[in-house]
């Protein structure tokens, strides 16, 4: 066998994108590799070129159609192959039978906005992007707030165990700058994982009124 270790991991965004990462110890950075997708019950097949993302890791996106089109369902199986060029031929490096709705990672939430801000409270809303209608309300969210002098890793996680696209942050400090992020995960799928964190939303609480206790 080829020396070292390798890993091939793919996720479906629930609509029209399968993102894959291939890593192999000792593989040359300029190795030319591709991912091929062959669905078991669709007329199309798709290929993407793996591009380096780190020393021994490559990634690519299989774009199956328009961003909001529903290209796969719970009954689909897609056979995914990693092929790398060796001289004049392509060598199969890995093969995976991929059940899209067992391997979900949604797009990061978008359109974060402050709905209402006070001295100690802030109401924030967001939207989910390119999420399948199949989920109906079977989604959960995690949110975190960056306070001054802390890191994101130190921020406590707030869990929303339902499809709730808003949050009311409380016990905030007046006249203070904060940042807020949220991520989403479907309840379905053995290998499903959290979406990336949203872009941070910066906001500032209102100053306390002069002469009043805070």
């Amino acid at each position: 066998a080829v020396n070292g270790t390798s890993q091939f991991t793919c996720f479906y965004n629930s609509r029209a994108n399968i993102s894959c990462v291939w890593s192999q110890d000792g593989a040359l950075q300029d190795t030319s590799c591709q991912v091929h997708a062959w669905p078991d019950r669709r007329r199309w097949n798709q290929t993407c070129e793996l591009l380096p993302v780190s020393q021994a890791s490559w990634a690519c996106n299989l774009i199956l159609g328009a961003p909001d089109s529903q290209k796969l369902t719970t009954v689909d199986i897609v056979t995914l192959r990693v092929l790398c060029r060796e001289g004049v031929r392509w060598r199969v490096m890995a093969i995976q039978d991929f059940k899209p709705f067992e391997n979900l990672r949604l797009m990061a939430p978008i359109s974060l906005q402050v709905v209402h801000v006070e001295t100690h409270r802030c109401n924030i809303s967001w939207e989910i992007s390119q999420a399948s209608h199949y989920f109906e309300r079977h989604l959960e969210f995690e949110a975190r707030t960056l306070s001054p002098g802390h890191t994101w890793e130190e921020a406590p996680l707030l869990t929303l165990k339902q499809k709730q696209e808003w949050i009311c942050l409380e016990t905030l400090t007046p006249d203070t700058q904060y940042e807020f992020q949220v991520r989403v995960k479907p309840l379905q799928g053995e290998f499903t994982t959290w979406s990336p964190w949203s872009q941070p939303l910066a906001f500032r609480t209102k100053p306390a009124a002069l002469g009043k206790d805070t």
């Epitope: 390798s6 091939f8 056979t79 490096m93 890995a94 093969i95 995976q96 039978d97």
Partner: nanobody, 121 residues
Amino acid sequence: QVQLQESGGGLVQAGDSLRISCAASGRIFSNYAMGWFRQAPGKETEFVAGITHLTSTTHYADSVKGRFTISRDNAKNTMHLQMNNLKPEDTALYYCAADRNIKITADWSYWGQGTQVTVAS
């Protein structure tokens, strides 16, 4: 606990056929690709063949293509490797392995103990 148990190895003559098998615990068998690796004395572990768990897509090393056939019996949680036209260079300890992917690297998640295949010239 995952169990992979090989059987069917033995001593055969060059040109003969042999079928080795691998029994797996149910959860592994229904959720993982299965494969065969081999290790000859003094050599590195070599990928032989693999089969995926849902579509039974197969992949073979060039050295065995056309001679070996991998298959799986889902009703019995068993995988087989039918080896025809065996050659002395096929002599090795044959390992059954399971992983989410067929990979040509020998870092699969689960391994059996191995069954010895010896091909005499």
